[in-house]
């Protein structure tokens, strides 16, 4: 049974607006038509699900309406964007990819992307 390798960048810095983007790329052992991508956040050994989307190859990723994630897919690459991040959200963001259909099922977990978020400095008070 072949393994499925998932690659993601080691470090990403969020923008001053609290937006972080990274690519999650998987080496598909087969020709999957249905793929599920999950982003998990690990901080202090606690793991929580940030967002998840299931998509059909060739179609757009659809996250829930209230999700902080958006994304697009191109072949075996998923471009993920996480919004609304604050300094307290700094942590390791793990990309998990599942090839749901057709069988056989495959699961791959990336090494994680350390996302650093720095809250912007407040604007100095204006004299005017």
């Amino acid at each position: 049974c072949k393994a499925m390798h998932v690659a993601q960048p080691a470090v990403v810095l969020a923008s001053s607006r609290g937006i972080a983007s990274f690519v999650c790329e998987y080496a598909s052992p087969g020709k999957a038509t249905e793929v599920r991508v999950t982003v998990l956040r690990q901080a202090d050994s606690q793991v929580t699900e940030v967002c998840a989307a299931t998509y059909m190859m060739g179609n757009e990723l659809t996250f829930l309406d209230d999700s902080i994630c958006t994304g697009t897919s191109s072949g075996n690459q998923v471009n993920l964007t996480i919004q609304g991040l604050r300094a307290m959200d700094t942590g390791l963001y793990i990309c998990k990819v599942e090839l749901m259909y057709p069988p056989p099922y495959y699961l791959g977990i990336g090494n994680g992307t350390q996302i650093y978020v720095i809250d912007p400095e407040p604007c100095p008070d204006s004299d005017f």
């Epitope: 699900e49 791959g108 977990i109 090494n111």
Partner: nanobody, 115 residues
């Protein structure tokens, strides 16, 4: 180096139960997924169930209702409780561990359901 040690396989009559165990040794990431696959003669190796360290569980359709997966994070051990076994559950069962950036297979354990 990560190693997986399985136990609990054997011969059981139809309708009986077995509990498989798989213990991981070595250093593994705090987020990980442990699970079971099985391979019947002449068939491909198929997922039975898996469970993540944060408790998320997935079952294959063939395992729903009769099989229960659980784990002890402190012992780095996963269990597969198999009830109401049928002859078609006869297969070689494999433990699998997914960690950040890697995965590992255990040694096989044979499960035979026959009267």
């Amino acid at each position: 180096e990560v190693q997986l040690v399985e136990s609990g396989g054997g011969l059981v009559e139809p309708g009986g139960s077995l509990r498989l165990s798989c213990a991981a040794s070595g250093s593994i990431s705090s987020y990980n997924v442990m699970g079971w696959y099985r391979q019947a003669p002449g068939q491909q190796r198929d997922l039975v169930a898996h469970i993540a360290s944060n408790g998320e569980i997935m079952y294959a359709d063939s395992a729903k209702g009769r099989f229960t997966i659980s784990r002890d994070n402190a012992k780095k051990t996963v269990y597969l409780q198999m009830n109401s076994l049928k002859p078609e559950d006869t297969a070689v069962y494999y433990c699998k561990l997914w960690v950040l950036g890697n995965d590992y297979w255990g040694q096989e354990t044979q499960v035979t359901v026959s009267s």
